[in-house]
Amino acid sequence: MMTGTIETTGNISAEKGGSIILQCHLSSTTAQVTQVNWEQQDQLLAICNADLGWHISPSFKDRVAPGPGLGLTLQSLTVNDTGEYFCIYHTYPDGTYTGRIFLEVLESSVAEHGARFQIP
């Protein structure tokens, strides 16, 4: 039975040209995390494998930094980066847990972080 929950940074906003940290945290399970995939809509941005380390997709390698932890840092943000991001935790023996973050990239300096929320 899958007992874990994923806590994410929720709905967040950031300024164009700036950077943002995407963070998820898996709790309430003793399952072993083997890999975390970070996806934007249907596009894979990065993989953090427990053994192999980070794999950043080439089209993002110049502006995506691994970490902190299992999170992902997006740099040099553009308005096109606005959208849904998913952290997909591959665990053993539980299976797969998915968290969702919505990022809005703003032109002005009124960007504020949204509230954290949980996805069961």
Epitope: I47, N49, A50, D51, K61, Y92, P93
Partner: antibody, heavy 119, light 106 residues
């Protein structure tokens, strides 16, 4: 055309060290990850390790830890595998595939380098 | 390390036949399973990534399926050029390959 061209065959003595090269063309190695894979005659494939040429970060299979060293020279777009303390079981073809754009699979392979360890 | 066991070790088929090769993992690897073909004295060639995703330039007769611990590679209508070794590879943990299946065309 995206390709990886490897150095020529080597014949080395037991206990020696060999350094193999893998030159990339059609892409910048800093944009991807370069791996090395061993294949003994008539046998299966064994992953040795990988490097992120952008920062030099390496990971090795436990079996090859301490004996294999993967490096790159980004100015010449070339990756290297150095294997030390060679023994007869190291007689094999060594391949340098690059990782795919979306993970730890291998979408482009070098032609392979045959290494023969013999006294 | 995760062990991949391929079956059969050897298969002989006639052209236009459908072939199914299997790869079983010693523990669940989600869909982190990839397939390669290797002909004698050639480098391996990627056929399928992530269990079922097709690769540009690979004939559509090659398809993959499976998840967890059991995966298959199917060749819909075998052609003479499909002979060789077929290897599976997992990327859920330290990278490992199956021992291979040798495909012979009668």
């Amino acid at each position: 055309e995206v390709q990886l061209v490897q150095s020529g065959a080597e014949v080395v003595k037991p206990g020696a060290t060999v350094k193999l090269s893998c030159k990339a063309s059609g892409f910048n190695i800093k944009d991807t990850y370069i791996n090395w894979v061993k294949q003994r005659p008539g046998k299966g494939l064994e992953w040795i390790g990988r490097i992120d040429p952008a920062n030099g970060d390496t990971k090795y299979a436990e079996k090859f830890q301490g004996r294999a060293t993967i490096t790159t020279d980004t100015s010449s777009n070339t990756a290297y595998l150095q294997l030390s303390s060679l023994r007869s079981e190291d007689t094999a073809v060594y391949y340098c595939p690059k990782s795919g754009d979306y993970g730890w699979y291998f979408d482009v392979w070098g032609q392979g380098t045959m290494v023969t360890v013999s006294s | 390390d995760i062990v991949l066991t391929q079956s059969p070790d050897f298969q002989s088929v006639t052209p236009k036949e459908k072939v199914t090769l299997s790869c079983r993992a010693s523990q669940s690897i989600s869909n982190n399973l990839h397939w390669y073909q290797q002909k004698p004295d050639q480098s391996p060639r990627l056929l399928i990534k992530y269990a079922s995703q097709s690769i540009s330039g690979i004939p559509s007769r090659f398809s993959g399926s499976g998840s967890g611990t059991y995966f298959t590679l199917s060749i819909n209508s075998v052609e003479a050029e499909d002979f060789g070794m077929y290897f599976c590879q997992q990327s859920n943990s330290w990278l490992t390959f199956g021992q291979g299946t040798k495909l012979e065309i009668k």
